[in-house]
């Protein structure tokens, strides 16, 4: 029995004075606790606890289930114990079949013995199957068998406690080990959509998927820079033993503009944390914003092609798109498509393909687009550059030579005189009058220029050239005349187009 210094309280003493006692089933258990300040006896085995306020614990006919630790405690809280084995050949093991182990930790298979004097108290696999080679265990007849450092691979392992008797194994009831996995990585989190655009009053619903090895992963939706608790609903599944999935759905039934912001799905386990965000933008009404991809004033040469391209943002989705020219709608020659296939896409492209444009096809080309909330339009002013065309070249009754040319950009008319039969008309003649005439055609059409010179200035036979030109090209017309005495012959005009 323990010895203590005088004056100090001492633990109680127990008779019989040994740490372990073995009795046969049916025999009496008689334990005496001696202490001036006796308080109680306590009996413990597995999860069972009994108390007795008498200083002598007597069990007249011992049963296997009386196997366990008997502790006597005094008023100072000091105690002494004796472990009693009740030997019962019919019941070698006391068992608590619940068996949970945390990965990498030890776990106890609770099968204490009723007789410590047995051989090879150990673990065996069910139905003769071998145990995993790396499964290490420590036998303790009073407590059971401790499995060291539980592995995930031991999950659902079926085993028995075993002892050898007369060359045969005696097995306990079976145990099924359930392994609680350790977190060895942060949770995997993903969100149904990275961004949401809604109109006021529409429902906002976003789902976060959390994946981990077990359901003890923590997760929550948070609003950035806010402590407000958000309403979320959960669904969860176990896909196999260590593959857990939870879906946390956040819903705002009628979103307001001030609900706009960043929402974070946060998850953590004992290893660490992970998060993913989604952005909500709530607008009071829909919108359309159009961005021309080329200049809205377009210059194109006669016979060439041009593509009018716009990008536009539309929310909600665009419902009607059209290209218009001269109050007529194009039924073909244009295409409209989303800028990306992303579910959140609000950006679109529209292209009008104008081919082999004629001088008469300049003008305003308008793109119109609408959705359920708004309409929007953008106009392109298309100018077709054409080589000058000489419309008229005449000698007027007042003796003037007149040349009228049309083209775009506005043609310039120069006059030249060629004496005699010379081909090259180099001597320039200044016009008397130059006018830009209003075209009767549509705007953006050809510009008409009229230029006149006084033919009385010419005293010799020769040719007069009217040359109309612009950035695109040039065209000439010629007036031939000759003197007969003092009289001028009738002038014969002809043209020569110079490419």
């Amino acid at each position: 029995q323990p010895s203590v210094s005088p004056g100090e309280p001492s633990p109680p003493s127990i008779h019989p004075g040994k740490s372990d006692l073995i009795v046969r089933v049916g025999d009496e258990i008689r334990l005496l606790c001696t202490d001036p300040g006796f308080v109680k006896w306590t009996f413990e085995i597995l999860d069972e606890t009994n108390e007795n306020k008498q200083n002598e614990w007597i069990t007249e006919k011992a049963e296997a289930t009386n196997t366990g630790k008997y502790t006597c405690t005094n008023k100072h809280g000091l105690s002494n114990s004796i472990y009693v084995f009740v030997r019962d050949p019919a019941k070698l093991f006391l068992v608590d079949r619940s068996l949970y182990g945390k990965e990498d930790n030890d776990t106890l298979v609770r099968c204490p013995l009723t007789d410590p004097e047995v051989t090879n108290y150990s673990l065996k696999g069910c139905q003769g199957k071998p145990l995993p080679k790396d499964l290490r265990f420590i036998p303790d007849p009073k407590a059971g068998i401790m499995i060291k450092s539980v592995k995930r691979a031991y999950h659902r392992l079926c085993l028995h406690c075993s002892v050898d008797q007369e060359g045969k194994s005696v097995l306990s009831e079976k145990f099924i080990l359930k392994v609680r996995p350790a977190f060895k990585a942060v949770p995997v989190v993903s969100v149904s959509k990275a961004s949401y655009l809604l109109r006021e009053g529409e429902e906002f619903t976003v789902t976060c998927t959390i994946k981990d090895v077990s359901s003890s992963v923590y997760s929550t939706w948070k609003r950035e820079n806010s402590q407000t608790k958000l309403q979320e609903k959960y669904n969860s599944w176990h896909h196999g033993d260590f593959n857990y999935e939870r879906q946390a759905t956040l819903t705002i039934s009628s979103a307001r503009v001030n609900d706009s912001g960043v929402f974070m799905c946060y998850a953590n386990n004992t290893f660490g944390s992970a998060n993913v965000t989604t952005t909500l933008e709530v607008v009071d009404k829909g919108f359309i914003n159009i961005f021309p991809m080329i200049n809205t004033t377009v210059f194109v040469n006669d016979g060439e092609n041009v593509d009018l391209i716009v990008e536009y943002e539309a929310f909600p989705k665009p419902e009607h798109q059209q290209w218009i020219y001269m109050n007529r709608t194009f039924t073909d020659k244009w295409e409209d498509y989303p800028k990306s296939e992303n579910e959140s896409n609000i950006r679109y492209v529209s292209e009008l393909h104008l081919t082999r444009l004629k001088g008469t096809e300049g003008g305003t080309y308008t793109f119109l687009v609408s959705n359920s909330d708004v309409n929007a339009a953008i106009a392109f002013n298309v100018y077709v550059n054409t080589k000058p065309e000489i419309l008229t070249y005449d000698r007027l009754v007042n003796g003037m030579l007149q040349c009228v040319a049309a083209g775009f950009p506005e043609p310039t008319i120069d006059w030249y005189f060629c004496p005699g039969t010379e081909q090259r008309c180099s001597a320039s003649v200044l016009p008397v009058d130059v006018q830009t005439l209003n075209s009767s055609g549509p705007p953006f059409g050809k510009l008409v220029v009229q230029s006149s010179i006084d033919s009385s200035a010419f005293k010799h036979n020769g040719t007069v050239e009217c040359k109309a030109y612009n950035d695109v090209g040039k065209t000439s017309a010629y007036f031939n005349f000759a003197f007969k005495g003092n009289n001028k012959e009738q002038i014969h005009p002809h043209t020569l187009f110079t490419p």
Epitope: P116, T119, S122, G125, L135, R136, F137, P139, K148
Partner: nanobody, 127 residues
Framework: QVQLVESGGGLVQAGDSLRLSCAVS????????MAWLRQAPGKEREFVAA????????YYQDPVKGRFTISRDKAKNTVYLQMNTLKPEDTATYIC????????????????????WGQGTQVTVSS
């Protein structure tokens, strides 16, 4: 300081019996496992048998099950290994050890973390 002294080794014929003794002195090893291990020349040390000093539970490695018996006499502070039907492959130095930690591996192999060791006694089994 705990001392373990082995005795009882010798040269025997195959099929004979031998009893080894391990005398414990220095202190009582009430919560200890007392074990016999053996080491043959050029081989690793292997567990043979063990007994819990106070509880009397016993543990045997497969090759000796049914042939060897471990026991203890608390009054004499001695552990015994009774070896019957000896085979030439039992030839080795037999070592007595005391340790608080006995463990099983995969259900068939026992091992002990020895805190105290004897010098060993030689057993030779001739065919």
């Amino acid at each position: 300081q705990v001392q373990l002294v082995e005795s009882g080794g010798g040269l025997v014929q195959a099929g004979d019996s031998l009893r080894l003794s391990c005398a414990v002195s220095g202190r009582t090893l009430s919560n200890y496992f007392m074990a016999w291990l053996r080491q043959a020349p050029g081989k690793e040390r292997e567990f043979v048998a063990a007994i819990h000093w106070s509880l009397g539970s016993t543990y045997y490695q497969d090759p000796v099950k049914g042939r060897f018996t471990i026991s203890r006499d608390k009054a004499k502070n001695t552990v015994y290994l009774q070896m019957n039907t000896l085979k030439p492959e039992d030839t080795a130095t037999y070592i007595c050890a005391a340790g608080q930690h006995l463990s099983g591996l995969g259900g068939s192999a026992w091992s002990i973390e020895g805190d105290y060791w004897g010098q060993g006694t030689q057993v030779t089994v001739s065919s």
